[in-house]
Amino acid sequence: EEELQVIQPEKSVSVAAGESATLNCTATSLIPVGPIQWFRGVGPGRELIYHQKEGHFPRVTPVSDPTKRNNMDFSIRISNITPADAGTYYCVKFRKGSPDVELKSGAGTELSVRAKPSAPVVSGPAVRATAEHTVSFTCESHGFSPRDITLKWFKNGNELSDFQTNVDPAGKSVSYSIRSTARVVLTRRDVHSQVICEVAHVTLQGDPLRGTANLSEAIRVPPFLEFTQQSMRADNQVNVTCQVMKFYPQRLQLTWLENGNVSRTEMASALPENKDGTYNWTSWLLVNVSAHRDDVKLTCQVEHDGQPAVNKSFSVKVSAHPKEQGSNTAAENTGTNERGSSDYKDDDDKHHHHHH
């Protein structure tokens, strides 16, 4: 009789996670009598996967009925494959004995598991930043195999190039993770913008996974402030408005001060949205000119999204003589735009004189 050979025809087998893997093995002879065992790995630390003679292996079934007469097919099927099952499997023939004696091993079959990456999760900065600043977005996806993967970043459909990507671990592993950080320069128009992280992998059949983040979570657009004054009314009252324009997010508190004293505080709420996602708000103050001897310094103080307050001041001129019908008063915008930060300019620093 010919000498026994143990044949594992496939050097490698690739299976999608959740499917079954068939590992083929045949012997060339019935002699000697003895069981087949399947192991993952080699040496003293090898893991027993299936023993024809004894043990309980719920995920493993022999492809061929082991009781079949003259059976020389020792292929097995492993169900519900996970990335943890990856490795090289050896079909090993034993000679019957007490104990059984290892006789000959097949060449081994490497099982690789194709596992889909998890849905990419995109996270933005912890604190908001303003236009012209650069913020970082991070994209993470886990549990994929094989290691080869492609990740792209987009902002409003346009591919980004300023990003850094790492796939871990660097060496062999049952599954891998990817982490990428993209740097995005903000503009005032980015309230409605979106960044997309796109992951392509062999398991996705050309249909990449996407994770998104809205720049609205990352951006702060500070307001412009502008004063306007209507003509003095017959009852010696002047209506002054403070226009707070093009800000985001909506969280805003406005305080009116008359000669440095708080007159009224308001909170913005339920404002209509501009096309670009920003908000406008107009607050007015009725100044009773006849109640003042001297000019009234009005200050519109805006605290936006927890940032240092922005002040805009405006003087309402009161004439030196007692008021009569037809006498004129003037209100003057002094043009001061006081703010803790110098990030913003007030382009309205002209003087306005209004006559009744």
Epitope: E1, V33, Q52, H56, P66
Partner: antibody, heavy 119, light 110 residues
């Protein structure tokens, strides 16, 4: 190691039935055939039948086809051989044996159960 | 059915001498290159023990003074140097189809 432990001796009257058990251990019961062989006093070996515990497939010696029934209980790894309509010439030691190589051979044997048929 | 006939029915051999037992099948027991003949040893009060499988292969733990040979219909069990513990009845069995045994050969010491 492989062990086949058989039930104790039986004394039966002619016409009665006997059911001999064989409890297997030390291997996966469903992966190997169980054979039943008998030996009358001072006589040779006579093959009765075999059963595959995984699916209860059986093969019988024509001589015993109508009187013998093989069964298994995989939950207890036990094989059974029932012989009906006993006659005095059924007096014998009944052996169970495991076929390790699926060659229809008998690699491991139980110690035997003596069945005596006497009126 | 294939009938196996063993010869002789009994045999007496001196210790240390060669013992030869024959088994003839009524038709060939060969299939796919294998000879489906098995040899068993049975000592008094014990179950049989497998010695040789597929005509010529020694089972695990069997002393190498035992050997098997033959093909087709004629087979031989040989004990090259008889030991006292070899006194037993020897049976051949085929499994070309459903198993049958030879009638047995009683081996004694001369």
């Amino acid at each position: 190691q492989v062990q086949l432990v058989q039930s104790g001796a039986e004394v039966k009257k002619p016409g009665a039935s006997v059911k001999v058990s064989c409890k297997a251990s030390g291997y996966t019961f469903t992966n190997y055939w169980i054979n039943w062989v008998r030996q009358a006093p001072g006589q040779g070996l006579e093959w009765i039948a075999m059963i595959d515990p995984s699916d209860s497939e059986t093969h019988y010696n024509q001589i015993f086809k109508d009187r013998a029934t093989l069964t298994t209980d995989t939950s207890t790894s036990t094989a059974y051989m029932e012989l009906r309509s006993l006659r005095s010439d059924d007096t014998a030691v009944y052996y169970c044996a495991m076929d390790y190589g699926s060659l229809y051979a008998m690699d491991y044997w139980g110690r035997g159960t003596l069945v005596t048929v006497s009126s | 059915d294939i009938v196996l006939t063993q010869s002789p029915d009994s045999l007496a051999v001196s210790l240390g001498e060669r013992a030869t037992i024959n088994c003839r099948a009524s038709k060939s027991v060969s299939s796919s290159g294998y000879n489906y003949i098995f040899w068993y040893q049975q000592k008094p009060g014990q179950p049989p023990k497998l010695l040789i499988y597929l005509a010529s292969n020694l089972d695990s733990g069997v002393p190498d003074r035992f050997s098997g040979s033959g093909s087709g219909t004629d087979f031989t069990l040989t004990i090259s140097s008889l030991q006292a513990e070899d006194v037993a009845v020897y049976y051949c069995q085929h499994s070309r189809d459903l198993p049958t045994f030879g009638q047995g050969t009683k081996l004694e010491i001369k």
